[in-house]
Interface confidence: medium
Amino acid sequence: KVFGRCELAAAMKRHGLDNYRGYSLGNWVCAAKFESNFNTQATNRNTDGSTDYGILQINSRWWCNDGRTPGSRNLCNIPCSALLSSDITASVNCAKKIVSDGNGMNAWVAWRNRCKGTDVQAWIRGCRL
């Protein structure tokens, strides 16, 4: 599923991401835009043999199990395929664990490079939330 901007903002708010660990909803929508272009089925492979999955591009070395990543930790205790569902519950729950891990949203390279320090509220402007 490819979400619309406001559709995703509403879904993320319903799942309790607005101001989760101090990060406003705009940060999460911005991260999803530049990680996956709002596509729940996005996958991208990394040079270390891991793969990033889903709307927030969650990594298989640390956070989920795809059955084939060397030394996978699966800290969210889920199959990576669950992160590709049109229902973003699994991605949100895992993202909450990631953002609580110490580095905050810096865990997402795209957020660090494209969203951090920008007007992230623009990503929810005009949305009925």
Partner: antibody, heavy 116, light 107 residues
Framework: QVQLQESGAEVMKPGASVKISCKAT????????IEWVKQRPGHGLEWIGE????????YYNEKFKGKATFTADTSSNTAYMQLSSLTSEDSAVYYC?????????WGQGTTLTVSS | DIELTQSPATLSVTPGDSVSLSCRAS??????LHWYQQKSHESPRLLIK???QLQSGIPSRFSGSGSGTDFTLSINSVETEDFGMYFC?????????FGGGTKLEIK
Amino acid sequence: QVQLQESGAEVMKPGASVKISCKATGYTFSTYWIEWVKQRPGHGLEWIGEILPGSGSTYYNEKFKGKATFTADTSSNTAYMQLSSLTSEDSAVYYCARGDGWYCYWGQGTTLTVSS
Amino acid sequence: DIELTQSPATLSVTPGDSVSLSCRASQSISNNLHWYQQKSHESPRLLIKYASQLQSGIPSRFSGSGSGTDFTLSINSVETEDFGMYFCQQSNSWPRTFGGGTKLEIK
């Protein structure tokens, strides 16, 4: 138990296309990558690429881009590989395998012969 | 691409002998190396995963070792059913690659 059942042998003319199937049973098809491997005598085993059936995500070995196309049907638990513009170089045994990094589960192989 | 070089290409042995097959990677692949046996007209069969982990159902006479670039598959006291081709495969990076194979034949 996990099984992968491939379609039968094919004899094709040069320039034609062929679609090989791989039906999976015994596990959740959508959650594991399906890999495709080519074997020609004297050429060993070559990795063609992979598809994640649940999302349709595909990755191809550069060498096979434009030659192979992967699809999957989660309603029938079947993965497909189409090979186009066939030449004698495409004559080989083609295997599907479940992608766990290693390959514990293989299909029985589909023999493709390209001959005029 | 990571190249895997297997040696020797052919190994002629008598049942009861112990043998070692080599697989060398063109760059370090940690322990992300797997071994397969293939008999004529059959699909490959996984023997060892991650360099040294014996796959379930595989006889204990098979063992694997190595890390980085140099790997070895050992067969302690070869049996007649062990003759065939042996391939190594790396899962450290894409594209996945296989070695050219070692043929284990009866002397």
